[in-house]
Amino acid sequence: SRLRQEDFPPRIVEHPSDLIVSKGEPATLNCKAEGRPTPTIEWYKGGERVETDKDDPRSHRMLLPSGSLFFLRIVHGRRSKPDEGVYVCVARNYLGEAVSHNASLEVAILRDDFRQNPSDVMVAVGEPAVMECQPPRGHPEPTISWKKDGSPLDDKDERITIRGGKLMITYTRKSDAGKYVCVGTNMVGERESEVAELTVLER
């Protein structure tokens, strides 16, 4: 086809942005290009072309008319992680191609299984008590809090320190006795550990 004066090569006018998305949630990587004739858009991840519903109608990835890449749900397993990675969109027409900036798609996850559940503890009044848990693996790394008898633990109490997965009570009172649960939280949600009982004995 011969070059028409009004034709021009593609240029990216909206670049995709980095995303962090929860597993199972929808997501969109934006891309908009100009050019005449209207450029075709393809997406690449780690140098490999990304399959969309244009290739396989069952695909969970859709190429939108705008050129954006829409994920019906972010797919992310224990081993296979087909959606995570660094993406670029490429706009092409007969005059050339334009490549977007890199955009990383990270998947936020929070597994179900605590790596370490807290254990029952028995102490005498006035003695220190320590409970320890390791929350499920997660990204971003889950923060840890504790509940006592179903309510958030009062960490303003100067006797109580929460550091890493450790709950430390410097000197126990009878009122500290109860059922404790470790809670791991990130943007995906929260997970609760198994219950551990703190028993405080009279001296």
Epitope: E48, E51, D56, V75, G77, R78, S80, P82, D112, D113
Partner: antibody
């Protein structure tokens, strides 16, 4: 269309090795782990291990360690399973299977019959 | 290794019957459990993943339930094409159960 196409049937002598191939098409080869599963005649499914096509890392259950090798060639989107020191009880249909991001084997090859007989 | 125990190993049923197959894990596996159907001479086919999610294209008469150590596959109304062998698989260590053969009564 997403599919896995395996190499043809093999007949081997005890002590020999066999290499089965699995050609992937219709998806991003490096995005999904590939597994190998075998099934002896009239028996159940036995998982043999996985390969991460992106890195080449592998993992096998104790039973197959030292006897199985899994490799891949990303340029031709093909995974390979090599089983050495064959015995008669290795006679089975060998399947490759893609592990989805939902932790399940969603796409399977058609199977390769390997017969070990003297 | 986590051992998967399926029961029964075989069962006889008629078209239209409700069929239940159970799978027990030797330790807790959360919802990391899949179910497959296999017909003679064919590769297995994924039915259910993550204990209860129906794979694309699988008829809704198949359902899965359970969490932790005990899991169930239910076929609400058995169809002629459902006579096959069914396998559970835990997706932590990837081992399969021994299979359940569903035969015509």
């Amino acid at each position: 269309e997403v599919q896995l196409v395996q190499s043809g049937a093999e007949v081997k002598k005890p002590g020999a090795s066999v290499k089965v191939s699995c050609k992937a098409s219709g998806y991003t080869f490096t995005g999904y782990y590939m597994h190998w599963v075998r099934q002896a005649p009239g028996q159940g499914l036995e998982w043999m291990g996985w390969i991460n096509p992106k890195s080449g890392a592998t993992n096998f259950p104790q039973k197959f360690q030292g006897r199985v090798t899994m490799t891949r060639d990303t340029s031709i989107t093909t995974a390979y399973m090599d089983l050495s020191r064959l015995r008669s009880d290795d006679t089975a249909v060998y399947y490759c299977a893609r592990e989805s991001g939902d932790d399940a084997f969603d796409i399977w090859g058609q199977g390769t019959m390997v017969t070990v007989s003297s | 290794d986590i051992v998967m125990t399926q029961s029964p190993s075989s069962l006889s049923a008629s078209v239209g019957d409700r069929v239940t197959i159970t799978c027990r894990a030797s330790q807790k596996i959360s919802s990391y459990l899949n179910w497959y159907q296999q017909k003679p001479g064919k590769a297995p086919k994924l039915l259910i993943y993550a204990a209860s999610s129906l794979q694309y294209g699988v008829p809704s008469r198949f359902s899965g339930s359970g969490s932790g150590t005990d899991f169930t596959l239910t076929i609400s109304s058995l169809q002629p094409e459902d006579f096959a062998t069914y396998y559970c698989q835990q997706s932590v260590g990837l081992f399969f159960g021994g299979g359940t053969k569903v035969e015509i009564k």
